[in-house]
């Protein structure tokens, strides 16, 4: 039974705000022509809006976004030897969030 | 092309550690027999291991986990009127993480 649990506290809503998330730097973002290389680092932190809103008609959405270029290392394997190159990946950080109405189907008049 | 950006900083690895994530409290967690109710809050924060490791053979995994019961409100709609009930949901928080070797497929002998 995995041990006895403590008394249940009231659940607190995860408010709509920016949180740190992990962004995977896929190789296809660096080079679509071949897969014979590694990317370092394989993942980075980004700031993203998350959380929930008062009802299902509103969603937690970014209201302010910043694009942040970062330099990664592309490590090509040529004749079993590593060749180091540089590549740029542009990350999307969310700076501010808001519970916004979801675009719903408009009633036909 | 589509817009100029600032100078690219070296990318920093998103290390393997606990981060705050949002956990959606689905109605199925509360009651699998009917869907004629709402849950409040619809989501909560949990601590989860995330990030990446030095190579593809290792993965960021929790080494210590804690179960945390929280009390939510189950709002049943009966004859268009809300009836408030309480329910308990057990959340899983990760307390510690580690880059662990992925269990590979064992060769058939």
């Amino acid at each position: 039974s995995l041990g006895s649990l403590t008394v249940a506290e009231p659940a607190m809503i995860a408010e709509c705000k920016t949180r740190t998330e992990v962004f995977e730097i896929s190789r296809r973002l660096i080079d679509r022509t071949n897969a014979n290389f590694l990317v370092w680092p394989p993942c980075v932190e980004v700031q993203r809006c998350s959380g929930c809103c008062n009802n299902r008609n509103v969603q937690c959405r970014p209201t302010q976004v910043q694009l942040r270029p970062v330099q990664v290392r592309k490590i090509e394997i040529v004749r079993k030897k590593p060749i180091f190159k540089k590549a740029t990946v542009t990350l999307e950080d969310h700076l501010a969030c808001k519970c916004e109405t979801v675009a719903a189907a408009r009633p036909v008049t | 092309s589509l817009g100029s950006l600032t100078v690219a900083e070296p990318a920093m690895i998103a290390e393997c550690k606990t981060r705050t994530e949002v956990f959606e409290i689905s109605r199925r967690l509360i009651d699998r027999t009917n869907a004629n109710f709402l849950v409040w809050p619809p989501c909560v924060e949990v601590q989860r291991c995330s990030g990446c490791c030095n190579n593809r053979n290792v993965q960021c995994r929790p080494t210590q986990v804690q179960l945390r019961p929280v009390q939510v409100r189950k709002i049943e709609i009966v004859r268009k009127k809300p009836i408030f009930k309480k329910a308990t949901v057990t959340l899983e928080d990760h307390l510690a993480c580690k880059c662990e070797t992925v269990a590979a497929a064992r060769p058939v002998t």
């Epitope: 962004f23 995977e24 730097i25 896929s26 296809r28 973002l29 679509r32 980004v46 993203r48 809006c49 959405r61 970014p62 976004v65 694009l67 740029t88 990946v89 542009t90 999307e92 950080d93 969310h94 | 092309s1 589509l2």
Partner: antibody
Framework: EVQLVESGGGLVQPGGSLRLSCAAS????????MSWVRQAPEKGLEWVST????????YYADSVKGRFTISRDNAKNSLYLQMNSLRAEDTAVYYC?????????????WGQGTLVTVSS | DIQMTQSPSSLSASVGDRVTITCRAS??????LNWYQQKPGKAPKLLIY???SLQSGVPSRFSGSGSGTDFTLTISSLQPEDFATYYC?????????FGGGTKVEIK
């Protein structure tokens, strides 16, 4: 293997609405920009809309601006296109496509398409 | 908006032929040009991106060249599976625009 599967197409009257969905698998959906491209019967390709990997940036063709809304749910590996005030000229096969990163603006992998017919 | 003009709109060729399709942009787009192949009833497929880079898995008989306003897609030795419609697309600025297409038919 990259897979994109569109759904939600069908017959709708002028002025009506439809919501298209695209279910993605076989790649890290949350790392890629995504797009919708359409093709009217026996015609060429027309770009409709593009959304950034985090959903914070959206771009539209003038022909759909103010009527269509692109969105995504990275937790569900899903892309959406809410289409309102539909017109006969919106009749087309709608494809969802993976669009690489910020500097790419291409259509790398495509779904099989879903047909939207706007007719009275 | 950047207009993309493809020529010819259609061509007839035989297996083994060298085929060249051109695409012209209404203004300079540097190397921000992509090429796609579409077969009847199927979704398009990316062949070439950034004017000359071959998408992973695409046969080496396909090649792209050009920069600025004039671009070329070349199929060095046409194969039976290459009979299709080819589109160019500029990725220099929004709105993203496609050429009208070139249909490659069997002679």
């Amino acid at each position: 293997e990259v897979q994109l599967v569109e759904s939600g197409g069908g017959l709708v009257q002028p002025g009506g609405s439809l919501r298209l969905s695209c279910a993605a698998s076989g790649f890290t959906f949350s790392s890629y920009w995504m797009s919708w491209v359409r093709q009217a019967p026996e015609k060429g390709l027309e770009w409709v809309s593009t959304i950034s990997d985090g959903g914070g940036l959206t771009y539209y063709a003038d022909s759909v601006k103010g009527r269509f809304t692109i969105s995504r749910d990275n937790a569900k590996n899903s892309l959406y296109l809410q289409m309102n005030s539909l017109r006969a000229e919106d009749t087309a096969v709608y494809y969802c496509a993976e669009s690489g990163g910020y500097t790419d603006w291409l259509f790398g992998y495509w779904g099989q398409g879903t047909l939207v017919t706007v007719s009275s | 908006d950047i207009q993309m003009t493809q020529s010819p709109s259609s061509l007839s060729a035989s297996v083994g032929d060298r085929v060249t399709i051109t695409c012209r942009a209404s203004q300079s787009i540097s190397s921000y040009l992509n090429w796609y192949q579409q077969k009847p009833g199927k979704a398009p497929k990316l062949l070439i991106y950034a004017a000359s880079s071959l998408q992973s898995g695409v046969p080496s008989r396909f090649s792209g060249s050009g920069s600025g306003t004039d671009f070329t897609l070349t199929i060095s030795s046409l194969q039976p599976e290459d009979f299709a419609t080819y589109y160019c697309q500029q990725s220099y600025s929004t709105p993203l625009t496609f050429g009208g297409g070139t249909k490659v038919e069997i002679k």
